[in-house]
Interface confidence: medium
């Protein structure tokens, strides 16, 4: 047995006479032989579930579910209840109604075996019948919605009449009907005004019925019509077996460059027309088992279950269903020397499915693990400026397919042929297994005899000791210019373009900082800032070279505070900033502030475009359009 609603609403007035019927509660059957029996909870509850008093006023007919006033609720009773409501005005009280047999202990009230009946209390007597509006004569203030389980016997789940109105205003005639399309499984009995299902419902055919209840009020010569929504939701049970969409029960996959733990190797999809078990229970009741194979397979792979709700079309309406993705996942990093082929089977069991048929499927995965060889190009050729500052990134080395690698460890080393000309360093990028070449020793750059730098690049996978080698020729270009005395270590400190471009800073390949002009669109990833190289900084990512010194790119790497409009980076730096962002690495602070536009007035020379002077932009000259100007003014 279950209630067709989890909550009911009615009004209560002071001194309403004993014997006044209030409302019916309805139970629906789970099995044809069940007979409902209703029981009221012992207490009345108020605001925040406060237990107010033993219920001495309202009774229920155990067999019909009719709630009625056993005795009148007078003003003194009401004041007594109000005094116990934690100081809140008592506007609503509620009772719990249970379906027997249930435990006699009055605990939590949870659907389906318990419903709450809420009474809106009015500290006045019942209004004169003539003063009631048609809406008040027809329907409760709170619109009901109904829950009906699929595949269950049909039954009565609602009664339209407002019983207190019918009892106290017998001269007012109220008629009801349901507006519904042809062939819908509901009927409203014209005599009893009971609404019932004609037959058992199938949620997989239709999940929601948006009906309309029509009430016609006759009071003397007056006839008025009131319409309200009458929604019915069909509740699911596990009556559908899992199936393979398009019959696909096998997936084939090759493991080559992606060898990292947690890599998804292949996915097979299972469809289930049901949406039960509910998400909390789903993984426990919808099981997947990797069938025993050899030890290596059991250690190397696991199956992950990813259920997702979806919508499917049935009889012209959409109903929810579930797709279950079963992912074959690497349980550990695979060595680049690993080379084998295997077949895996996964047993999926919808353990709640009762038939007909089986709730079990067998998934098949064919997997080939291929070995990876390390190859480098025969040689690299790069150039570097004599003015480059320490930590300037000048290029990358990368074994074949390194961009596609994950879970493959490659370490790069540089071996210099000229000991006094060892200018460069190399670090392995965690992102793409490439080696980033950077300036490590600026003194060597200045030596006249170091015009050409010769290196051997060695890439090693330490797990297997496999190696690859390549020649690297670096040409040193340009004339050395001494670093300016008044310049900061970090490009990022400069707040304005002229300050930025007159200095160099750590990480600068040209020996000069670069100004990145932002797009001016509020808090944006493309904020204005001063950088050693706009190719690498800021790009929302603190790379392996930038981690070597906070002065290189605090915009990406700072862990300190950011003042002003911004979105912080994860786990550090500035993901997005407002206007111009500059940073003070020693103080572990960045500032993001509006660009300094003050006086964008125009003369005859600049109708289409406006040249905003350095004064207006705080040290920067820039052509901006009417639209930009409006945007800056607006901000």
């Amino acid at each position: 047995l279950y209630f067709s609603r989890d909550a009911y609403w009615e009004k209560l007035y002071v001194d309403q006479p004993a014997g006044t019927p209030l409302l019916y509660v309805h139970a629906l059957r789970d099995a044809p032989e069940e007979v409902p029996s209703f029981r009221l909870g012992q207490h009345l509850y108020g605001t925040y579930r406060t237990r107010l008093h033993e219920n001495n006023w309202i009774c229920i007919q155990e067999d019909t579910g009719l709630l009625y006033l056993n005795r009148s609720l007078d003003r003194s009773s009401w004041e007594k209840l109000s005094g116990r409501n934690r100081g809140f005005p008592l506007l609503t009280v509620y009772l719990k109604v249970f379906l027997s047999p249930t435990s006699l202990r009055e605990g939590e009230c949870q659907w389906p075996g318990c419903a709450r009946v809420y009474f809106s209390f009015f500290n006045t007597s019942f209004p004169a019948c003539t003063s009631l509006k048609p809406r008040e004569l027809c329907f409760p203030e709170t619109r009901p919605s109904f829950r009906i389980r699929e595949n269950r016997p049909p039954g009565t789940f609602h009664q339209f009449r407002l019983l207190p109105v019918q009892f106290l205003c017998p001269n007012i005639s109220v008629a009801y009907r349901l507006l519904e399309g042809e062939g819908l499984p509901f009927r409203c009995a014209p005599d009893s005004l009971e609404v019932s299902t004609r037959w058992a419902l199938d949620r997989e055919q239709r999940e929601k019925y948006e009906l309309v209840a029509v009430c016609t009020v006759h009071a003397g010569a007056r006839e008025e019509v009131v319409m309200v929504p009458f929604p019915v939701t069909v509740y699911d049970e596990d009556d559908s077996a899992p199936t393979f969409p398009a019959g696909v029960d096998t997936a084939s996959a090759v493991v080559e460059f992606k060898r990292k733990e947690d890599t998804v190797v292949a996915t097979l999809r299972v469809f289930d027309a049901d949406v039960v078990p509910a998400s909390g229970e789903l993984v426990r009741r919808y099981t997947s088992t990797l069938l025993p194979g050899d030890t290596w397979t059991q250690q190397t792979f696991r199956v992950e279950h990813w259920p997702n709700e979806t919508s499917v079309q049935a009889n012209g309406s959409f109903v929810r269903a579930t797709v279950h993705d079963y992912r074959l996942v690497l349980n550990r990093n695979l060595s680049i020397s690993e080379n084998r082929t295997m077949q895996l089977a996964v047993l999926v069991n919808d353990s709640d499915f009762q038939g007909p048929g089986a709730g079990v499927l067998l998934l098949h995965f064919n997997v080939s693990v291929l070995p990876v060889s390390l190859h480098l190009p025969s040689s690299y050729s790069l150039s570097v400026s004599r003015r480059a500052r320490r930590f300037a990134q000048i290029g990358k080395v990368c074994v074949e397919n390194c961009q596609a690698f994950s879970g493959i460890n490659v370490q790069y080393e540089l071996h210099s042929s000229g000991a006094n000309c060892s200018t460069l360093g190399v670090v392995t990028s965690a992102e793409d297994t490439s080696g980033i070449l950077f300036v490590n020793d600026t003194k060597a750059l200045r030596r006249p005899k170091c015009a050409e730098l010769h290196y051997m690049v060695v890439a090693t996978n330490h797990q297997t000791s496999r190696q690859a080698q390549a020649q690297l020729l670096v040409t040193v270009e340009g004339l050395y210019v001494a670093e300016e005395a008044g310049c900061p270590l970090s490009c990022a400190v400069s707040k304005r373009r002229p300050e930025c471009e007159e200095c160099g800073g750590l990480g600068s390949p040209t020996g000069r900082c670069e100004w990145r002009q932002g797009d001016g669109k509020g808090i944006t990833r493309n904020f204005s800032t001063c950088s050693p190289s706009t190719k690498t900084c800021p790009d929302g990512h603190c790379d392996v070279v930038e981690t070597q010194d906070i002065n290189i790119c605090p915009q990406d790497c700072l862990r300190g505070s950011i003042v002003g409009g911004h979105e912080p980076g994860e786990p550090r730096g500035i993901k997005a900033g407002y206007g111009t962002c500059n940073c003070f690495p020693e103080e572990e602070k960045c500032f993001c502030e509006p660009e300094d536009i003050q006086d964008p007035l125009c003369d005859e020379l600049c109708r289409e475009q406006k040249l905003i002077s350095e004064e207006d932009l705080g040290g920067e000259q820039k052509l901006i359009s009417e639209e930009d100007l409006h945007h800056h003014h607006h901000h």
């Epitope: 300016e484 008044g486 471009e501 200095c503 003050q598 350095e614």
Partner: antibody, heavy 125, light 107 residues
């Protein structure tokens, strides 16, 4: 030793144009973080910033005087020139030039660390 | 333009006194503020940059503090040579602006 010296006419007539020159020594006008500002001070009144030129030749001006001011520099002569048009008796003041540069140790922050002695300009018919 | 309001406009103090001058900006200027001392007939002299950084060669009795909109110049023990007019200057936003000055006189 860093020095700045202002030069220009002592007396100008109303509506005339004033040309002031600041000759610097001990640093280069093209060095990074080396800029020069002009500031004036009417008799018995507060200082007022007029204009600035950066080492990169970018310029900036006081909003209220922008239409009357022009600043420029000649790096080879180590000179910064301020031209002020349409002079008026209220422009009577001592005019200073000052070097604006960054301060050690981090070279983050700026200050006008060296000033000229100033040149007094009287506007009268 | 950002207004810089200095207070008091003038003050009388004795040698050895602790003197505090404040400067308030009409909007936040971070710490982009300098303090300058000017004696009659002389050019101003930079005392403090970045609100609190003492210029080399300036006696340690001078100190600066503050950030955002409120700034203070403190002379911990006034000396005879400190009687002068003091100005604050913001160079956070164009146009750069000076305060109206505080004249420190001998009581």
């Amino acid at each position: 030793q860093v020095t700045l010296k202002e030069s220009g006419p002592v007396l100008v007539k109303p509506t005339e144009t004033l040309t002031l020159t600041c000759t610097v020594s001990g640093f280069s006008l093209s060095s990074a973080r080396m800029g020069v500002s002009w500031i004036r001070q009417p008799p018995g009144k507060a200082l007022e910033w007029l204009a600035h030129i950066f080492s990169t030749d970018e310029k900036s001006y006081s909003t209220s005087l922008k239409s009357r001011l022009s600043i420029s520099k000649d790096t080879s002569l180590s000179q910064v020139v301020l031209i002020m048009t349409n002079m008026d008796p209220v422009d009577t003041a001592t005019y200073y030039c000052a070097r604006r540069t960054t301060m050690a140790p981090y070279y983050y922050y700026y200050g006008m660390d060296v000033w000229g002695h100033g040149t007094t300009v009287t506007v009268s018919s | 333009a950002i207004q810089m309001t200095q207070s008091p406009a003038s003050l009388s103090a004795s040698v050895g006194d602790r003197v505090t001058i404040t400067c308030r900006a009409s909007q936040g200027i971070r710490n982009d503020l300098g303090w300058y001392q000017q004696k009659p007939g002389k050019a101003p002299k930079l005392l403090i940059s970045a609100a609190s950084s003492l210029q080399s060669g300036v006696p340690s009795r001078f100190s600066g503090s503050g950030s955002g909109t409120d700034f203070t110049l403190t002379i911990s023990s006034l000396q005879p040579e400190d009687f002068a007019t003091y100005y604050c200057l913001q160079d956070y936003k164009y146009p750069w602006t000076f305060g109206q000055g505080t004249k420190v006189e001998i009581k």
